[in-house]
Interface confidence: low
């Protein structure tokens, strides 16, 4: 006989993340005796909650909460029963509870608190519901793009850790509701709210970062749609063929598409809006998103935001990913450079409503808004961030990294567990299980 | 046809507690969620809460916090509601309600559909 | 919380008139429903998310208004029509109703 070492108790935490059209959510694991070494937490499994986002329950708190239960009931399954008293739970909203909190912070709390109602219920270590900022929501991208793809720390043959000459990736992610840039920079930000500086596993990071509420992708969507209803009475976006009945009421409830609400509008009526498929107007609609006017700064991205020069590589996920994945896989079009990015959302544009269908077979349902959602895109990197053809050859548009998904939620697991250590690890050497 | 059948009056004294009932019929009693309203005398309607009674978890208006206890029991399809420290104040008509929503574009929209006859509670020594 | 007002508290109208309630809000919502309330009864829906009929509601009356201002018209009052009215806002917590409009035909 010989002896049999056995592989380490593993340890879970539990992230639920409300995002604004959806939420997701994802259960990690490390194994108990390698808490602090870089790259050992990894996605165990997840769930998608069915139906809209918390937000969307503001009429309805409990439902927000009852629509959670099922994924929970999924989450008892998934970590073993010995380890749902140690298993921490975080739900964490982003956007679409930042605008809700904005127009009725009172929907806004009693939806956290009947989350917090039900997820008191179960057996984890509940450690509370909060709205993140959009800062805390860049940053976290940051960490977990970065801790995903081994950056800060790496364990070397000679048994030490050192930290990899690469650099760290910049973060693009695009929501609902909100989207983030956040990168690594050398220089102190002009605008201090710009700057967070982080410890890591004994190294310094000054990092760049900044949310724009309202450009989500469903917000922008919302914000186009009232665009080409106050100015054209057609959708340019929208392929020719398309047709559909807008209720103004739908339109204008956002505070993104306040600006551009008539004084009298009818909330109940219906107004039957078509598309065009005129890539040319659809991208003058895009446009109008971004104002360039002033920059009380050096230098800005746009609406007088202060940004440095966009430097590095960079990972580009959530509805990044999905949009350019759209165009790479659906519509088999190149999208290796900028000018080819332009070019995909203009072949996308000028597809009539019967050719888009014929081409995308069985994918109904926001068909209808990838010509937006490509223009957008493509207007964001290289207008809005400033990215040029060579800056843009460093960005990789992904979904996930060593089979965990990207975004913002295992960072922010990451940060409240401590498993991010501020201190370097000491000469330990790892022992592989596997 | 969709009912919800609640019992005439309840005659209670101050200090003491209250518990009424509503029985739904006709409709998959955990597919909608259940709410209360208060209407005293010659007065205006104010919500109380609700229920889902798939999952047992309600919401409150803070005003009626401690006041009111929402509950239901599946099996009879049958939503309670227990009022506690009874007083003048508390003497109205309590109806329950079907909450009825239809969804337009991700937003879930709410009225009541169906309401009870309502139970008339007096609190009076 | 939002408080809804409804004017006048209390209407007399003749059979046939067109008569107008309004509801005002103290703060702006998406959407409001509308109650009627005949004598001794429950309530019962009449319109909702502002301007649709509810079933077997008669299509003498309609809604509209947007924001902080809405209203209830019946092109042509009958007997029946005698009742209380209310609004009712779901747009922020806690869900609110108006006072009320009792209307009574001459």
């Known amino acids: 006989t010989r002896d049999v070492r056995e592989p380490p108790a593993l340890k879970y935490g539990i992230v639920l993340d409300a995002g604004s059209s959806h939420t997701s959510m994802f259960i990690y694991k490390w194994p108990a005796d390698k808490e602090n070494d870089t790259g050992i937490v990894g996605q165990h499994s997840s769930c998608d909650v069915p139906g809209g986002g918390i937000s969307s329950y503001a009429d309805n708190p409990s439902g927000a909460s009852q629509s959670l239960v099922g994924c929970l009931e999924q989450a008892l399954q998934d970590v073993p029963k010995e380890r749902h008293a140690g298993t921490p739970l975080y739900l964490g909203a982003t956007a679409g509870m930042r605008l809700l909190n904005l127009t009725n912070p009172e929907a806004s709390t009693s939806v956290l608190m009947a989350v917090t109602h039900t997820l008191t219920q179960y057996p984890f270590d509940f450690r509370g519901a909060r709205i993140l900022s959009g800062q805390e929501e860049g940053v976290f991208g940051w960490v977990t793009a970065n801790y995903l793809l081994e950056n800060f720390i790496k364990y070397g043959w000679v048994g030490r850790w050192f930290r990899p000459r690469k650099g760290t990736l910049g973060a693009m992610d695009l929501g609902g509701a909100s989207t983030q840039i956040t990168f690594e920079t050398t220089s102190p930000a002009e605008d201090r709210a710009s700057e967070v500086q982080l410890h890591l596993y004994g190294q310094h990071y000054r990092v760049y970062t900044h949310s724009f509420l309202c450009y989500g992708r469903d917000q922008v969507l919302q914000r186009l749609l009232a665009s080409a209803l106050q100015t054209h009475g057609f959708h340019p976006c929208w392929p020719r063929g398309f047709s559909t009945q807008v209720l103004l009421g739908d339109v204008y409830q956002s505070p993104c598409t306040m600006a551009q609400r008539p004084q009298n509008f009818n909330s109940s009526a219906r107004v039957s809006l078509s598309g065009s498929s005129d890539p040319h107007l659809c991208r003058d609609l895009v446009s109008g998103l971004f104002s360039f006017s002033s920059c009380p700064f050096s230098r800005c991205s746009f609406n007088g935001v202060f940004q440095p020069p966009v430097a590095g590589n960079f990972v580009a996920f959530s509805a990044f990913f999905y949009t350019v994945d759209f165009l790479r896989t659906s519509m088999g079009l190149p999208v290796a450079t900028l000018q080819q990015l332009e070019a995909a959302a203009v072949n996308v544009c000028n597809q009539t409503w019967a050719q888009l269908q014929a081409r995308v077979p069985g994918q109904r349902a926001r068909l209808a808004d990838y010509c937006a959602g490509a223009m957008f895109v493509q207007q964001l990197l290289s207008r809005g961030y400033g990215f040029d053809e060579r800056a843009f050859g460093g960005v990789i548009f992904q979904k996930k990294a060593a089979d965990t998904a990207v975004g913002w939620a295992l960072g922010y697991m990451l940060n409240l567990t401590n498993l991010i250590p501020a201190d370097p690890p000491g000469l330990r050497k790892g022992t592989d299980f596997s | 046809e969709v009912q919800l059948q609640q019992f005439g009056a309840e005659l209670v004294k101050p200090g003491a507690s209250v518990k009424i009932s509503c029985k739904a019929s006709g409709y998959t009693f955990t597919d909608y969620n259940m709410d209360w309203v208060k209407q005293s005398h010659g007065k205006s309607l104010e919500w109380i809460g609700d229920i889902n009674p798939k999952y047992d978890i309600s919401t409150y208006n803070q005003q009626f916090k401690g006041k009111a206890t929402l509950t239901v029991d599946k099996s009879s399809s049958t939503a309670y509601m227990e009022l506690r420290s009874l007083t003048s104040e508390d003497t109205a008509v309590y109806y329950c309600?079907?909450?009825?929503?239809?969804?337009?574009?991700?937003?879930?929209?709410?009225?009541?559909?169906?309401w009870g006859a309502g139970t008339t509670v007096t609190v009076s020594s | 919380q939002i408080v809804l007002t409804q004017s006048p508290a209390i209407m007399s109208a003749s059979l046939g008139e067109e008569i107008t309630l309004t509801c005002s809000a103290s703060s702006s919502v998406s959407y409001i429903h509308w109650y009627q309330q005949k004598s001794g009864t429950s309530p019962t829906l009449l319109i909702y998310s502002t301007s649709n009929l509810a079933s077997g509601v008669p299509s003498r009356f309609s809604g509209s208004g947007s924001g902080t201002f809405y209203s209830l018209t019946i092109s042509s009052v009958e007997a029946e029509d005698a009742a209380d009215y209310y609004c009712h806002q779901w747009s922020s917590y806690p869900w609110t109703f108006g006072g009320g409009t009792k209307l009574e035909i001459k």
């Open positions: 309600a079907r909450r009825g929503f239809f969804l337009y574009y991700g937003i879930n929209y709410y009225y009541f559909d169906v």
